[in-house]
Amino acid sequence: MMTGTIETTGNISAEKGGSIILQCHLSSTTAQVTQVNWEQQDQLLAICNADLGWHISPSFKDRVAPGPGLGLTLQSLTVNDTGEYFCIYHTYPDGTYTGRIFLEVLESSVAEHGARFQIPHHHHHH
């Protein structure tokens, strides 16, 4: 049975041209994390493999930085970066846990971080 939950930075906002850290944390499971994938809609942004380290998608290398930890830093934000981001934890033996973050990139300087909150996890087994 999968007991884990993913806590994320939740709904967040940031200024155009600025940067933002996307963070997820997997808790309540002893499963081994083998890989974390960061995705935006239908695009893979980055992979952090437990054995092999970080690998950033070539199309995002100039704007995405690994970390801190298993998180991801998005830089030089544009309004087009607004949308859903997913952290996908591949674990053994549990399977896959998914966390969702919604980022809104604002034109104005009135950008505030949403409160950290816990979301239900979506999952499937390998």
């Epitope: 992979i47 493999n49 380290g53």
Partner: antibody
Framework: EVQLVQSGAEVKKPGASVKVSCKAS????????IEWVRQAPGQRLEWMGV????????NYKEKFKGRVTITADKSSSTAYMELSSLRSEDTAVYYC??????????WGQGTTVTVSS | DIVMTQSPDSLAVSLGERATINCKAS??????VAWYQHKPGQSPKLLIY???YRYTGVPDRFSGSGSGTDFTLTISSLQAEDVAVYYC?????????FGGGTKVEIK
């Protein structure tokens, strides 16, 4: 110019081991992964495992765990794949490839390994 | 493991005509799919990565599309030098599995 040059063809008896080398040149060896892929006659390409030469971290396909060892020598920019307890089904062409974000942008020329009694 | 299923197994197309190869992943792989061309006696060559990005030096008659589980490689106008076996590969998670290959020939 990026190049991956592999060692020559090998003929081995069942139960023996084989060690294939892959010498990289033309790029920073520790900045990319080295992946190993094989193709048995009439079969699809099969990923075997990978090494990060910078960290030494490895990841193997489950079916090869305990039988394959991938290593890298930073001083000579050479990666090695050793496969033990060889059987006839291991007869294949073995390729090393440079891994960029887990796809393979440069490949070695291939090393034919024949396992026969 | 993620299973990559290619179709068709083989394809005969007239010179100058379009060739379309499909690849289906057994589970979600986002855009983590690459395509390779493999000619007899040669090493495979990378054509497409991240589903739709053409690799450096690859002719623009080759294009890729798809995301999630369904992917397509298209050769818009088949040339004689395109005769080969084409493989899809998922680079989403280890082990990095390949499709069974599609042999492209000239009709």
């Amino acid at each position: 110019e990026v190049q991956l040059v592999q060692s020559g063809a090998e003929v081995k008896k069942p139960g023996a081991s084989v060690k294939v080398s892959c010498k990289a040149s033309g790029y920073a060896f520790t900045n990319y992964l080295i992946e190993w892929v094989r193709q048995a006659p009439g079969q699809r390409l099969e990923w075997m495992g990978v090494i990060n030469p910078g960290s030494g971290g490895t990841n193997y396909k489950e079916k090869f765990k305990g039988r394959v060892t991938i290593t890298a020598d930073k001083s000579s920019s050479t990666a090695y794949m050793e496969l033990s307890s060889l059987r006839s089904e291991d007869t294949a062409v073995y390729y090393c490839a440079r891994g960029e974000y887990f796809f393979f942008d440069y490949w070695g020329q291939g090393t034919t390994v024949t396992v026969s009694s | 493991d993620i299973v990559m299923t290619q179709s068709p197994d083989s394809l005969a197309v007239s010179l100058g005509e379009r060739a379309t190869i499909n690849c289906k992943a057994s589970q979600h792989v986002s855009d983590g799919v690459a395509w390779y061309q493999h000619k007899p006696g040669q090493s495979p060559k990378l054509l497409i990565y991240s589903a739709s990005y053409r690799y450096t030096g690859v002719p623009d008659r080759f294009s890729g599309s798809g995301s999630g589980t369904d992917f397509t490689l298209t050769i818009s106008s088949l040339q004689a030098e395109d005769v080969a076996v084409y493989y899809c590969q998922q680079h989403y998670n280890t082990p990095h599995t390949f499709g069974g290959g599609t042999k492209v020939e000239i009709k």
